[in-house]
């Protein structure tokens, strides 16, 4: 069904990192425009990206209202210059996205090591608590605020002079590890949500090594 010379969107794909969420689709429009709708299972459809020639739509503002809900989006196709026109069913062509549950599926962004501090044979490594676009009481929540104990960080660390790598985990954003005195160490961290079945791990943070600007050293 559908209007002559319009084609339905296809390959609808969610791209989401730390809850910043974009719906992408194909094809690039030729003589047609798109409107996107998004809804939870309530069926209260909200229109976004009206009559656009883009093939992506930022739906972050909608999904951050409740990241634990499951969302569906649909992309409507209209003839350019005649958006009131409908198909033989009396409705424009449309296609549904896959279901998307942000809390379970948003990719974990690459973390950043905020600082590390050595005191004797111990090093405290702090991971930056990244701000998300999820709001509560008009303030933006951090990744830790949203995920709580579901989120852990894994620390990988090794002596500058060695290839042997050690690991440590934390349910907070801080690690306290034992090191050998007089040795320089390098660090990388990874965000993990162990309870997930997909998108469980972030990419590794950039490597930070002792003796560089992020560190503090105290005897």
């Amino acid at each position: 069904s559908g209007t002559t010379n319009t084609v339905a969107a296809y390959n609808l794909t969610w791209k989401s990192t730390n809850f910043k969420t974009i719906l992408e689709w194909e094809p690039k429009p030729v003589n047609q425009v798109y409107t996107v709708q998004i809804s939870t299972k309530s069926g209260d459809w909200k229109s976004k990206c009206f009559y656009t020639t883009d093939t992506e739509c930022d739906l972050t503002d909608e999904i951050v209202k409740d990241v634990k809900q499951t969302y569906l989006a649909r992309v409507f196709s209209y003839p350019a210059g005649n958006v009131e026109s409908t198909g033989s069913a009396g409705e424009p062509l449309y296609e549904n996205s896959p279901e998307f549950t942000p809390y379970l599926e948003t990719n974990l962004g690459q973390p950043t090591i905020q600082s590390f501090e050595q005191v004797g044979t111990k090093v405290n490594v702090t991971v930056e608590d990244e701000r998300t676009l999820v709001r509560r009481n008009n303030t933006f929540l951090s990744l830790r605020d949203v995920f709580g104990k579901d989120l852990i960080y894994t620390l990988y660390y090794w002596k500058d002079s060695s290839t042997g790598r050690k690991t440590n985990t934390t349910h907070t954003n801080e690690f306290l590890i034992d090191v050998d005195k007089g040795e320089n160490y390098c660090f990388s961290v990874q965000a993990v949500i162990p309870s997930r079945t997909v998108n469980r791990k972030s990419t590794d943070s950039p490597v930070e090594c002792m003796g560089q600007e992020k560190g503090e050293f105290r005897e």
Partner: antibody, heavy 118, light 107 residues
Framework: EVQLLESGGGLVQPGGSLRLSCAAS????????MSWVRQAPGKGLEWVSS????????YYTDSVKGRFTISRDNSKNTLYLQMNSLRAEDTAVYYC???????????WGQGTLVTVSS | DIQMTQSPPSLSASAGDRVTITCRAS??????LAWYQQKPEKAPKSLIY???SLQSGVPSRFSGSGSGTDFTLTISSLQPEDFATYYC?????????FGQGTKLEIK
């Protein structure tokens, strides 16, 4: 466990009115669209009406438009179908069903029989 | 309105058989199709949505396929509890419509 329990069916004369209720439990009622589907004796299924979780959007099959009104009370976890100007052809078992996105029907009640006869 | 035509209207089969029921829409509905099972004097039960997605708790012997106008429900190995009437339903556009049903009987 999702439970839907219809009530309010019975015998009514042509031209009469009836209000069906559907009490929902086991899920967050306001998070789901809901629907009514009917089945005349010995016949197949017929979609009647749907309503969004907020109650802002309602939809009807042509044969009941202007006669039936779907509504919901999210504070009571209850779905309603107000049926006016009833006709013999409205005789059926009426099922309430949960309807994710207002699309398919993933959980059904046991049904309530409405008989329109003089 | 979109018409949904199921075939066959009735079907006799034995436990262990592989059974296929088809549903044809009068116009394209993409994958916006559901399948239901109904036993006598009981409410329908959801089996499949989005043409091929299995409803939670439904045995894996049930599967759905198709897109556009032609759809199938397959039961890979019939069990005694599968003898029932099966309905397809389109949810592409209002008014939503059902097929007339396929009655699956014991041979």
């Amino acid at each position: 466990e999702v439970q839907l329990l219809e009530s309010g069916g019975g015998l009514v004369q042509p031209g009469g009115s009836l209000r069906l209720s559907c009490a929902a439990s086991g899920f967050t009622f306001s998070n789901y669209a809901m629907s009514w589907v009917r089945q005349a004796p010995g016949k197949g299924l017929e979609w009647v009406s749907s309503i969004s979780g907020s109650g802002d959007y309602t939809y009807y099959t042509d044969s009941v438009k202007g006669r039936f009104t779907i509504s919901r009370d999210n504070s009571k976890n209850t779905l309603y179908l107000q049926m006016n100007s009833l006709r013999a052809e409205d005789t059926a078992v009426y099922y309430c069903a949960r309807s994710p996105w207002g699309y398919y029907l993933d959980s059904w009640g046991q049904g309530t029989l409405v008989t329109v006869s003089s | 309105d979109i018409q949904m035509t199921q075939s066959p209207p009735s079907l006799s089969a034995s436990a262990g058989d592989r059974v296929t029921i088809t549903c044809r829409a009068s116009q394209g509905i993409s994958s916006r199709l559901a399948w239901y099972q109904q036993k006598p004097e009981k409410a329908p039960k959801s089996l499949i949505y989005a043409a091929s997605s299995l409803q939670s708790g439904v045995p894996s012997r049930f599967s759905g396929s198709g897109s556009g106008t032609d759809f199938t429900l397959t039961i890979s190995s019939l069990q005694p509890e599968d003898f029932a009437t099966y309905y397809c339903q389109q949810y592409n556009s209002y008014p939503y419509t059902f097929g007339q049903g396929t009655k699956l009987e014991i041979k």
